[in-house]
Interface confidence: low
């Protein structure tokens, strides 16, 4: 039988009464257009809807918005289009929300041609007032909140000019010209590239990077021959071109450009690009583009300086610059990462790495699911996810993977069971355990979210027919309950839930078509009634994550420590609440060689946890470049894994030694750095 | 050499607490858990709990929940056990000893388990009134 | 919690012989297992680990046997220095637990 539909599901009680008296419908009174919506802030149950909707004329685009607000989670709206002097709002730029909790929002305006500049809207309390100013420049980009300080906004001008203000949009000052990109940094720091010649384009490769820490009062040039920049984590990346070809470069700081250490990466060429796939306040993940138009290149991960990297994953899918890869952090287990490689036969693969990088494997075959037909052996194969890439090959995949940080070990997916990824109908997966073991949940492809930090899973399927059924899980995907919102099924969009999975409200959204008009109409179901009671100590049990062999007494070491959760058992039918918090006791492990990663000219052969030397380096001196210096490395080919908290066990020996030799990098020495003041 | 150093007898009054040190050498404190295990008189040996010395982390026997807390100094790379609410059953011979499991609560444990190698002198608590 | 059972509660041997003592888990421990030997006033001595290893140290007349439930040790050849108490413990899952004891005394 299907998942769900066997005997030892037990129903929900009287489900469909409760979730009747808690079903409320909004109809918006407008054509349908576009919509978008956006969360004001964290458990505030504030929504900001805009529609829009373009008539096109002969000459020109006549636009016309909406905008709708919700204190209720969606529950109920109401127009307050008056409040923005029923404007025209750029829906491009989106919804500017300020970080955390500051309740802040700005909206840009469309204005007419020959205006001196553009204007925005300014809330500060949540929406429920908003303050027209008007610009002095066009805005090229969304307004930009620095995360320190929600006051304090970047944006970019048609013109290429950097202007900030420092009280919330009020006033603006122009800092800088000749900009092509500008991100806020660490203690509201501002880095941005500048061009010299004509235009970002035409001086890509020969841009500088630019630094201020006073909201544009100096400047220090920090880096020039600059391809791009980024920022992951504490580390700030830039690639620069080579002295002597069309090459380049990944440089790295960790003192916000003060210092640079070239990073031991490949250079790539012009059609070739990097990507930073993740990062975080340890390490790294870099992806390397093979040259040629493969669609493929290498991962490497980083050592805790964002200098030495190991090669963690060959055959890397990746289409282009700003194309699409499978690359997913899984949120809801530590070190847990999934993507997808290109195969030698050009099939697409999914791989998943339980260490942040270290190992990559074939994702375990379902239990209850058989070899679809790219299978040679009907009894041996594995799960394939389908993500971005197959997303945007238009392949019947509505939603990429989900998982949340308080939801413990769930992951749920698109997949199909076979050797690669098949462009069949795919079936949505359910992983409890992070990734380890799955299980299919739902037959054919749906939309899905997770509500009360994983007490209650509800899914929609994907149909081009007009939908009225919604489904629903209180025991993580096993036995699934339909619950028929509306008797007038409308064209699906999308669902809505407040980010990180803490709400017991989800929103559908949709339009209704009529013979001369459709119109946009949303149905919030609140499931408190669902789960009556709230969790208590008995409705949760212990779980060791990353447990694979119950008999080791190293089971589940990850990263050199292990963790055991409180998690809601599957049985129980209650509430963990917006207030619950994921408890956790880690233990420390000792160390052993998976604790380590390669250092600098060693490699891990495959199944094997030694390092060893790599043929081409073997006898030569291990040398590379730390903060403009020459460095000599003494190693017996390993290091600590970044954020691995092993202690005692083995302890292989690695030393560093300043060869007090200048590194032959192009890059911009320390002492070559200028500063300037306005 | 490796040993590990407990504090002198007790002698202490039902209802009261008592705290037994156990202090390490000749190792890294930090490589190894630490166990506490007693003998009542005449009676066999009942394991109370056990401490991770890196975190500090602790997975106490059921019977002693509530009444035991074990912690660490790693300045001093000594462990401490304190037993709270005495009662003249707890009369005893209290043992630390090293244990190199990596158990955090009550989770599953070695494939290949090494023994508590190395085990303190022993500190007699008397409880009486 | 796992119940450790050990048989006989007292084994008397004359030196020079082999003693056989058993202990039985309550469910299975895998090779999770130690043997202790304890003398009068003494801290207990750790003799047998993993089932089987004997710890550094322990002369070969000790050997340990055994997996799942059904664990033996063996001295093969008893000195006057072994009369003492044994105790098995398991670490398969916490709480550790300890066996009653087998108290091995001169026939």
């Known amino acids: 039988s299907a998942p769900g539909e066997d005997e030892e599901c037990g129903r929900v009680r009287d489900f469909v009464a409760k979730l009747a008296n808690n079903t409320h419908q909004h109809v918006f009174d407008d054509l349908r257009g576009s919509v978008s919506l956006s969360w004001v802030g964290d458990s505030t149950g504030v929504i900001l809807v805009l529609t829009t909707f373009h008539v096109p004329l002969v000459i020109m685009t006549f636009g016309q918005s909406k905008l709708y607000r919700s204190e209720d989670y969606g529950k109920n709206f109401k127009d307050i289009t008056d409040l923005i002097n029923n404007t025209f709002i750029r829906t491009e730029f989106g919804m500017a929300i300020g970080p955390e909790n500051s309740g802040k929002v700005v909206l840009t305006a469309e204005v007419s041609g020959g205006s001196r500049g553009g204007r925005i809207f300014r809330s500060s309390d949540f929406a429920k007032n908003f303050v027209q100013t008007d610009l002095p420049f066009h805005p090229l980009t969304q307004m930009m909140y620095s995360p320190q300080n929600s006051d304090y906004l970047l944006a970019l001008s048609t013109e290429n000019g950097l202007w900030v203000s420092k009280n919330f949009g009020g006033k603006w000052e122009e800092i800088h010209k000749a900009v092509c990109l500008a991100k806020w940094g660490s203690d509201n720091t501002i880095f941005f590239t500048t061009y010299a010649n004509g235009s970002c384009k035409a001086d890509l490769g020969a841009l500088e990077l630019w630094r201020t820490s006073d909201l544009g009062k100096s400047f220090k040039t920090i880096g020039v021959k600059i391809y791009s920049f980024g920022l992951g984590g504490r580390f700030l990346f830039a690639s620069v071109m080579a002295d002597k070809d069309t090459t380049r470069r990944i440089h790295v700081s960790t003192d916000q450009g003060d210092t640079w250490s070239m990073a031991q990466l490949p250079s790539v060429g012009q059609e070739q690009f990097y990507s930073i796939l993740a990062a975080n306040d340890d390490m790294v993940f870099m992806h390397v583009d093979e040259p040629g138009d493969t669609g493929f290149g290498t991962i490497f991960t980083s050592d805790d300086r964002g200098i030495v990297y190991s090669k963690s994953l060959d055959r890397h899918l990746y289409t282009t610059t700003g194309g699409e890869t499978d690359f997913t952090n899984v949120t809801s287990l530590r070190g847990v990462y999934i993507t997808s490689v290109l195969s030698e036969d050009n099939s697409i693969q999914t791989m998943i790495t339980f260490d942040q990088g270290g190992r990559w494997t074939h994702l375990r075959k379902p239990e209850n699911s058989e070899c679809d037909a790219t299978a040679k052996n009907k009894n041996e194969c594995s799960l394939h996810i389908h993500a971005s890439y197959s997303i945007s090959q238009k392949l019947n995949v509505p939603m990429a993977p989900l998982s949340e940080p308080n939801a413990v070990g769930i992951v749920i997916a698109h997949g199909s069971v076979g050797d690669a990824i098949s462009v069949m109908v795919p079936d949505v997966y359910i992983s409890d355990d992070g990734g380890y073991s799955w299980t299919k949940m739902l037959e054919g492809p749906h939309y899905y979210t997770i509500l009360d930090s994983g007490g209650i899973i509800v899914a929609i399927e994907h149909s081009s027919r007009p939908i009225n059924v919604i489904k629903f899980s209180t025991d993580e995907g096993q036995c699934w309950q339909t619950y028929t919102f509306t008797r007038d099924p409308i064209y699906f969009t999308g669902l809505a839930s407040e980010p990180g999975a803490r709400s017991m409200n989800i929103s559908i959204w949709g339009f209704t078509e009529s013979f001369l008009t459709s119109q946009w109409v949303s149905y919030t179901i609140d499931f408190k009634d669902i789960l009556e009671r709230n969790c208590e100590e008995k409705d949760y049990t212990i779980w060791l994550a990353h447990s694979t062999d119950p008999e080791d007494y190293e089971d589940g070491c990850i990263l050199g420590y292990k963790e055991q959760f409180l998690r809601l058992r599957k049985s129980s039918v209650c509430q963990n609440g917006r207030d619950y918090v994921v408890t956790k006791q880690p233990s420390i492990c000792l160390c052993s060689l998976e604790d380590f990663l390669c250092d600098f000219g060693y490699y891990r052969p495959e199944n094997d946890s030694k390092c060893v030397e790599q043929p081409e380096l073997k006898g030569h001196d291990l040398e590379f470049c730390l903060y403009g210096r020459e460095e000599h490395l003494t190693t017996n080919g390993y290091r600590k894994i970044p954020g691995d908290k092993c202690q005692g066990g083995v302890n292989p020996v690695r030393e560093v030694k300043d060869l007090k030799k200048k590194c032959t990098s192009n890059f911009l020495s320390p002492e070559k750095q200028n500063s300037k003041s306005n | 050499q490796v040993q590990l150093v407990q504090s002198g007898a007790e002698v202490k009054k039902p209802g009261a607490s008592v705290k037994v040190s156990c202090k390490a050498s000749g190792y890294t404190f930090t490589s190894r858990y630490m166990s506490w295990v007693r003998q009542a008189p005449g009676q066999g040996l009942e394991w109370m709990g056990i401490?991770?010395?890196?975190?500090?982390?602790?997975s106490y026997a059921q019977k002693f929940q509530g009444r035991v807390t074990m912690t660490r100094d790693t300045s001093t790379s000594t462990v401490y056990m304190e037993l709270s609410s005495l009662r003249s059953e707890d009369t005893a011979v209290y043992y630390c000893?090293?244990?190199?499991?990596?158990?955090?609560?009550?989770?599953?444990?070695?494939?290949?388990?090494?023994?508590?190698?190395?085990w303190g002198q022993g500190t007699t608590v008397t409880v009486s009134s | 919690e796992i119940v450790m059972t050990q048989s006989p509660a007292t084994l008397s041997v004359s030196p020079g012989e082999r003693a056989t003592l058993s202990c039985r888990a309550s469910?299975?421990?895998?090779?999770?297992l130690a043997w202790y030997q304890q003398k009068p006033g003494q801290a207990p001595r750790l003799l047998i680990y993993g089932a089987s290893t004997r710890a550094t140290g322990i002369p070969a007349r000790f050997s340990g046997s055994g997996s799942g439930t059904e664990f033996t040790l063996t001295i093969s050849s008893l000195q006057s220095e072994d009369f003492a108490v044994y105790y098995c413990q398991q670490a398969r899952l916490g709480p550790w637990t300890f066996g009653g004891g087998t108290k091995v005394e001169i026939k």
């Open positions: 000893a090293r244990d190199p499991s990596g158990i955090a609560l009550a989770g599953p444990a070695s494939r290949y388990y090494l023994g508590m190698d190395v």
């Open positions: 469910q299975s421990v895998s090779s999770n």
């Open positions: 401490i991770n010395p890196v975190g500090g982390s602790t």
